[in-house]
């Protein structure tokens, strides 16, 4: 029972970390900036992993699409096919774990497989969650290292002058919505794990008991068929035969009356 | 590089008109804001009207009524139509843009090099 619940939690914990980290992938809020001291309006922008967006205190918005590749930073790139790995990891995580709870029945499926499915799907999450979270910190560190303070140089060019807008960078909302999202799927991952050694069932050997023929040394053992979870040596259910006459517990038996051959 | 070029100047008499436009050149991924200024000899240098992409105007209280501010997001072009010209508004009006260069980067704060308007009485 307490196997079933902690992999049917870490499966609601997982799908809410993935929703999350979909989420942040697609928010524009990944650091925010403010444009000060502008007499015509104030502006606020902010910027996310595909589009950056200008908000008046009118309320009106646009927002225009990052349609080069060429001029966005390496930093940004990495962080985008981080998220996406991401993404694609959980979903299909979320789709393998499906099939892995336990509560749910699909043909005849052994304890063992569904313990298999458990487990890579944990692992998956796991992953899944450590993309996330490594994505967002990439980003938020390129934006102290790099944006937290643009300065006010001004120089001449053709054109007249130029003056750099005096702005602050700040993390965006989507930072934390990924932090908590990475986070969720990454304990969702581990809880999948820790439900996946509760579903594979114990490796039994059964004691044996030998039956001797009469006139033949060859003792035929029963418990050669061993409980397999697939990890035993023994996988392939082989019928295991002993020239000596011993159990399991390498304890003599001696041939007696009630011997039945 | 931006450019700015301000264009439209020139001497007229006191209630005439003037339209002065400005086109922003270059590598130009957002104007959110283009404004108009103006520096009259020995005075500091004043904002005469600003235009946001979403319309929001802004007027010098000394303007208002007879300068109008437009612009063209598609042409990334500002205009000033000035009626009623005042001896007063005589000064070297500059164009003024807050512009994004690249899709990931800063905002700057480009000036054009300024056209002399003269309202003669």
């Known amino acids: 029972m307490a196997v079933t619940a902690c992999q049917g939690l870490g499966f609601v914990v997982s799908l809410i970390g993935i929703a999350g980290i979909i989420a942040a992938t697609c928010m524009d809020q990944w650091s925010t900036q403010d444009l000060y001291n502008n007499p015509v309006t104030a502006v606020f922008n902010y910027q996310g992993l595909w589009r950056s967006c200008v908000r008046e205190s009118s309320g009106f918005t646009e927002c225009r699409g990052y349609f080069t590749l060429l001029g966005l930073p390496a930093m940004l790139q990495a962080v985008r096919a981080l998220m996406i790995v991401g993404i694609v990891l959980g979903a299909i995580g979320l789709l393998v774990s499906i099939f892995a709870l336990k509560c749910i029945r699909i043909g005849s499926m052994e304890d063992s497989a569904k313990a298999n499915m458990t487990l890579t799907s944990g692992i998956m999450f796991i992953v899944s969650g450590l993309c996330a979270i490594a994505g967002v910190s990439v980003f938020a560190n390129m934006l102290v290292t790099n944006f937290w303070m643009s300065t006010a140089n001004m120089y001449t060019g053709m054109g007249g002058m130029v003056q750099t807008v005096q702005t602050r960078y700040t993390f965006g909302a989507a930072l934390f919505v990924g932090w908590v999202a990475g986070g969720l799927t990454l304990i969702g991952g581990v809880m999948m794990c820790i439900a996946c050694r509760g579903l594979a069932p114990e490796e039994t050997n059964y004691k044996a008991v030998s039956y001797h023929a009469s006139g033949h040394s060859v003792a035929y053992k029963p418990g050669g068929f061993k409980a397999s979870t697939g990890f035993g040596s023994n996988t392939k259910n082989k019928k295991i035969y002993d020239g000596g006459a011993r159990t399991e517990d390498e304890v003599q038996s001696y041939p007696s009356k009630h011997d039945y051959v | 590089e931006v450019q700015l070029v301000e264009s439209g100047g020139g001497l007229v008499q006191a209630g005439g008109s003037l339209r002065l436009s400005c086109v922003a050149s270059g590598s130009i991924f957002h104007i959110p804001i283009m404004s108009w200024y103006r520096r009259a000899p020995g005075k500091q240098r004043e904002l005469v009207a600003g235009i946001s992409t979403g319309g929001s105007t802004n007027y010098a209280d000394s303007v208002k009524g007879r300068f109008t501010i437009s612009r063209d997001n598609a042409k990334n072009t500002v205009y000033l139509q000035m009626n009623s010209l005042k001896p007063d508004d005589t000064a070297v009006y500059y164009c003024?843009?807050?512009?994004?260069?690249?899709?990931?980067?800063?905002?700057?704060?480009?000036w054009g090099q300024g056209t002399q308007v003269t309202v003669s009485s």
């Open positions: 003024n843009s807050l512009i994004k260069e690249e899709a990931w980067g800063t905002f700057g704060d480009y």
